[in-house]
Interface confidence: low
């Protein structure tokens, strides 16, 4: 980088290299070049050379003023013009930075995805710094008063086997850059409340062509959990309005749910689950897509995305899926 | 199934050192900590502290904080108690056990090592 | 810390009776989820047992003879109906905060 150059004088920046976005700077260039006498000293941003708001201020030092700085990063260097010399002769270099001071982390979130080995804590971090900003994760023991420090630039996993100062844990989160610094409020958390069931997934679907057609959506997951409540949201895919299904669930085998729905309609339908009297949700399931049929039955495979005719009792559907987009408001 | 099984008796002189291990199978070492306690004879039971089996990290209750040294070999699923500049009054079963997270209480020990001190 | 009181020192009791013990904390050792009070029984030259978790919690594998009971500082250990293989120390302990306290023991003898 600019920095590691060799220089002949100084280069400095006030009120600091890192500053806050949208504050007046000035950039000081100090020439200490053997046998010359600067005519005049050159600012360059960016290799770009600087024509206005430069001060002389002695014979060897020069001043670049700024108003409004809102760049969050830039590369400066001065040059100085020396008597005999054709070309400039570089003084010195520096990076800037411009930013903001980390808000307060809030709505500092931890969960254990089932079977990860993992606690995942995660909070909003508020406006963008563009500085490089760290953040803290402590977790403090209710039971035993250990505790343990996570350093980080985003969110963190901590293996739930270094959790062993019981199962009742303070966190809170410590933002902190080169302008400030700022502390969340405490998350109090009990490990068994926090465990989100492992991901439910949505195998198939067949419609029974019976004097009210039904479809069966047949769906499962591999949780040890013993309570789980689960939603199915469903609608067809011209609509914006989801339709919500409720279910108390035992995962001891494949949930069959039935729905009564339109004829000749592609459907998606996604499912969530939550240990029964928690608070935190699974994000929504793949997008799950079943077509029903208009008087045959049809078999849609999500596989090769296109549908095929079938001239069985039943429609199926099987599906990979892909994920949605619409997990927003779902974890909290 | 889970087991401590702990080091064979110990007799020494006031001033020496001990150290007591405690070989932890049946379950991955660095999950739970290991908790230490101590009985004189014909007393209580004292508790000389933990050690995070994943960080190393030893905890001493004021009583045992000085001459007593928890300490790990990971590789063997091996805890370790060292007792250094013994005196007669540390004449004791020493136990290792391990604590439920969730409860606090002691639901797997070690046999236990009786250390006696005497000149 | 808190000091754990046990009653009686010593106590006998004829096979197929009840034996009670208690256990007083100087302070609450519950909170609005549990109360972190334990049971626990020694025989000569062997470790401790864990009898009772959690104030009332069966360990695995207890006889249902043993029962837990109690919430705040007062805790109760009862045995019914005593059998000869109960003959024995026992000791409550807390896990509410450091350090972790025992009571000074029970002895069970069968008269």
């Known amino acids: 980088g600019i920095t590691n150059i060799n220089c002949s004088g100084h280069i400095w920046v006030e009120p600091a290299t890192i500053f806050k976005m949208g504050m007046n700077i000035s950039i000081y260039c100090q020439a200490a070049i053997k046998n010359c006498q600067p005519r005049k000293l050159h600012f360059y941003k960016n290799g770009i050379k600087e024509r206005f708001q430069i001060t002389r201020i002695n014979k060897t030092t020069a001043r670049l003023w700024y108003k409004n700085f809102l760049e969050p990063h830039a590369s400066m260097y001065c040059t100085a013009e020396c008597p005999k010399h054709f070309q400039e002769t570089l003084i010195c270099g520096k990076d800037i930075s411009s930013g903001y001071p980390p808000d307060i982390p809030d709505e500092v979130t931890c969960v254990i995805y089932e079977y990860s080995g993992n606690m995942t804590c995660t909070w909003n971090a508020g406006k963008l710094t563009y500085i490089d900003t760290k953040y803290v994760v402590h977790v403090k023991s209710l039971e035993t008063e250990e505790e343990q420090q996570y350093l980080t630039s985003s969110y963190i996993n901590i293996s739930t086997d270094s959790l062993q100062g019981g199962k009742k844990y303070l966190v809170w989160v410590q933002a902190a850059n080169a302008l400030g610094m700022e502390e969340s409020k405490q998350l109090q958390i009990h490990l068994d409340d926090i465990v989100i069931p492992s991901a439910a997934v949505i195998s198939r679907a067949e419609t029974i062509n019976a004097t009210v057609p039904k479809t069966i959506i047949y769906w499962d997951s591999q949780t040890t959990i013993e309570k789980v409540s689960c939603e199915m949201r469903y609608k067809a895919t011209t609509n914006q309005t989801w339709n919500v299904k409720e279910f108390d669930t035992n995962f001891t085998y494949v949930q069959q749910s039935e729905f009564y729905l339109e004829p000749n309609i592609k459907y998606v339908f996604q499912v969530r689950c939550q240990e029964t009297g928690k608070r935190y949700w699974q994000p929504w399931s793949s997008l799950f897509f079943h077509k029903t049929p208009e008087t045959v039955p049809q078999v849609t495979s999500k596989a090769f995305q296109h549908d095929t005719w079938n001239s069985g009792l039943t429609v199926a559907s099987i599906s990979t899926g892909h994920l949605t987009s619409d997990n927003r408001g779902d974890i909290g | 199934q889970i087991q401590l099984v702990q080091s064979g008796p110990e007799l020494k002189k006031p001033g020496e050192t001990v150290k007591i291990s405690c070989k932890a199978s049946?379950?991955?070492?660095?999950?739970?900590?290991m908790q230490w306690v101590q009985k004189m004879p014909g007393k209580g039971f004292k508790w000389i502290g933990w050690?995070?089996?994943?960080?190393?990290?030893?905890k001493y209750t004021d009583d045992f904080k000085g001459r007593f040294a928890f300490s790990l070999e990971t590789s063997a699923s091996t805890a370790y108690l060292q007792i250094s500049n013994l005196k007669s009054e540390d004449t004791a079963t020493y136990f290792c056990?391990?604590?439920?997270?969730?409860?606090?209480?002691?639901?797997?020990w070690g046999q236990g090592t009786l250390v006696t001190v005497s000149s | 810390d808190i000091k754990m009181t046990q009653s009686p020192a010593s106590l006998a009791v004829s096979l197929g009776q009840r034996a009670t013990i208690s256990c007083r904390a100087s302070?609450?050792?519950?909170?609005?989820?549990?109360?972190?009070m334990h049971w626990y029984q020694q025989k000569p030259g062997q470790p401790p047992k864990l009898l009772i978790y959690?104030?009332?919690n069966l360990e695995s594998g207890v006889p249902a003879r043993f029962s837990g009971s109690g919430s705040g500082t007062d805790f109760t250990l009862n045995i019914h109906p005593v059998e000869e293989e109960d003959a024995a120390t026992y000791y409550c302990?807390?896990?509410?905060?450091?350090?972790?306290?025992f009571g000074a023991g029970t002895k069970l003898e069968l008269k």
């Open positions: 056990a391990r604590s439920s997270a969730l409860t606090g209480a002691f639901a797997y």
């Open positions: 302070k609450s050792v519950s909170t609005s989820d549990y109360s972190y």
């Open positions: 302990q807390h896990s509410r905060e450091l350090p972790r306290t």
């Open positions: 049946g379950y991955t070492f660095t999950t739970v900590g």
């Open positions: 050690i995070n089996t994943h960080s190393g990290e030893p």
């Open positions: 959690l104030a009332s």
